[in-house]
Interface confidence: low
């Protein structure tokens, strides 16, 4: 018989089956079962420890003391239990890029931390810009080609949404300012309205200049929801406003509806990998 | 401002349960962060202790996981330490501190520490 | 446990050195590493987090570096308050620890 739970892992989870029960009871659901905050069922003779977290789609990448980027805290710890290994969140933000390495793909590259090192004329190029020294005034060239992208629409720090993860790179080079994913989907709240701007991205005509005070606002003003409204949201968070007095859902990617319920068709995924974005 | 401070008696004796509490003010422990003990014997380094999440999980460190417990009273806006069967080994300055930020475990702000002396 | 060892355990110098302390951990801990100052009697004030990055209020003179297993504080131009203990910290991994510190004297 196997002497631990990690001697039973299996790919999605782990499987213990053909021990009797009643010689070795180590394998019953308690609070130490599973480790790293996976889920303990026993169906008949089998205990499997699950972990499908029930991560939203926030993007609030965080770096792994694995080294390892992820899309935010949840998929972190979906992770750590996946792999039944500890994994911390060592800092937020993707994991550091090497430095100098000029390829424009780290998420958080040229993220406006102040450099310790001393400066060239070619510094000065952020966000996946390249220096051209020979140029008489411009320095920075952005040569991103967004044109082979697939559509995947996102909504960017800046407040405006852009058709995919490419072209918030793009922009974020030729403002070189910091322009990060903030969630998927296109910008939307239930009292703004979408404007089609004339560079052709469309801005939330009242999102607050910065994006990030916007989303901590709003965080503060939802609690978790209390016990007896497990399974109020099928696939998503549940959500408890101090200013309603029925819980809301904030669904995971791919869901829509009022408990999350129902499969949006229209979203198509990106996963945030160590360096730079997968479509899946 | 934020402000920590570390209360509890000063001298304790062997095998008995040390007790100390940190008060915080300017911040509610259950809106985030990470709220750490940590030690330091007369003339040596830092040992970390552990800490009490904002959602009230803890982490300890295994070198005292039998005997370490971090608790809080959110009412009061303060976490509490307790060692069990103290030895002389567990004299040092004992400090609160919070952590920076989320995902950032490095800590900002400390109590002024309280020295604990465990002698009969 | 990942041990951080620090080096030197002391130094003496002078008011305008420049100042350099090292601190190996026994794993890799990515950039998860912080350091701290602290005078006789006080406790610890953070100086540096995320190996590189200057806390609020902190002077520009006071750097971090390195990643991995390596890491550095520079005291650019060592300054009258300067004079104290350092440590270096780990985050990376449970249980957080320190290194054994390293006492600047003046020389």
């Known amino acids: 018989f196997p002497t631990s739970l990690s001697d039973c892992q299996t790919p999605t989870g782990w499987n213990c089956s053909g021990y009797d029960d009643r010689e070795n009871d180590l394998f019953l659901c308690d609070t130490n079962t599973c480790k790293f905050d996976g889920e303990c069922l026993r169906i008949g003779d089998t205990v499997t420890c699950v972990c499908q977290f029930k991560c939203n789609s926030d993007y609030v990448p965080v770096c792994g003391s694995n080294g390892e980027s992820y899309q935010n805290e949840c998929y972190l710890r979906q992770a750590a239990c996946k792999q039944q290994s500890e994994i911390l969140v060592v800092s937020e933000g993707s994991c550091a890029t090497d430095a100098g390495s000029g390829s424009g793909d780290g998420v958080h590259e040229g993220s406006g931390e102040t450099s310790q090192k001393e400066t060239s004329t070619c510094d000065i190029c952020q966000f996946g810009a390249e220096c051209d020294e020979d140029a008489e005034d411009v320095w920075c060239v952005c040569n991103i080609d967004c044109s082979q992208t697939n559509f995947n629409p996102l909504c960017a720090s800046d407040g405006k949404s852009y058709d995919n993860a490419c072209q918030i790179k793009e922009a974020s080079c030729q403002k070189q300012e910091k322009i990060e994913v903030m969630s998927l989907g296109r910008c939307q709240d239930n009292t703004t309205t979408t404007t089609k701007s004339e560079d052709g991205h469309y801005a939330r005509t009242d999102y607050a200049e910065n994006a990030n005070k916007l989303e901590e606002s709003a965080r503060e003003h939802h609690i978790p929801c209390p016990e007896h409204y497990n399974g109020f949201c099928m696939h998503g968070k549940c959500e408890h406003s101090i200013n309603m007095q029925e819980p809301s859902c904030r669904c995971d990617a791919g869901y829509t509806g009022q408990h999350c319920e129902k499969k949006d068709y229209s979203v198509l995924y990106v996963v945030p990998g160590p360096v730079r974005f997968q479509y899946v | 401002d934020v402000q920590l401070q570390e209360s509890g008696p000063g001298l304790v004796k062997p095998s008995e349960t040390l007790s100390l509490t940190c008060a915080v003010s300017?911040?509610?422990?259950?809106?985030?962060?990470?709220w750490s003990w940590i030690r330091q014997p007369p003339g040596k380094g830092l040992e970390w202790m552990g800490f009490?999440?904002?959602?009230?999980?803890?982490k300890y460190n295994p070198s005292l996981k039998n005997r370490i417990t971090i608790s809080r009273d959110t009412s009061k806006n303060q976490f509490s330490l307790k060692l069990s069967s103290v030895t002389a080994a567990d004299t040092a300055v004992y400090y609160c501190?919070?952590?920076?930020?989320?995902?950032?475990?490095?800590?900002?702000?400390w109590g002024q520490g309280t020295l604990v002396t465990v002698s009969s | 446990d990942i041990q951080m060892t620090q080096s030197p355990s002391s130094l003496s110098a002078s008011v305008g050195d420049r100042v350099t302390i090292t601190c190996k951990a026994s794993?890799?801990?990515?950039?998860?590493v912080a350091w701290y100052q602290q005078k006789p009697g006080k406790a610890p004030k953070l100086l540096i987090y995320?190996?590189?990055n200057r806390h609020t209020g902190v002077p520009s003179r006071f750097s971090g570096s390195g990643s991995g297993t390596d890491f550095t504080l520079t005291i650019s131009s060592l300054q009258p308050e300067d004079f104290a203990t350092y440590y270096c910290?780990?985050?990376?991994?449970?249980?957080?620890?320190f290194g054994g510190g390293t006492k600047v004297e003046i020389k």
């Open positions: 300017g911040y509610s422990i259950t809106s985030g962060y990470y």
């Open positions: 995320s190996a590189s």
């Open positions: 910290q780990q985050y990376s991994s449970y249980p957080f620890t």
């Open positions: 501190a919070r952590g920076l930020r989320r995902g950032d475990y490095s800590m900002d702000y």
């Open positions: 794993q890799n801990v990515v950039t998860a």
């Open positions: 009490i999440s904002y959602d009230g999980s803890n």
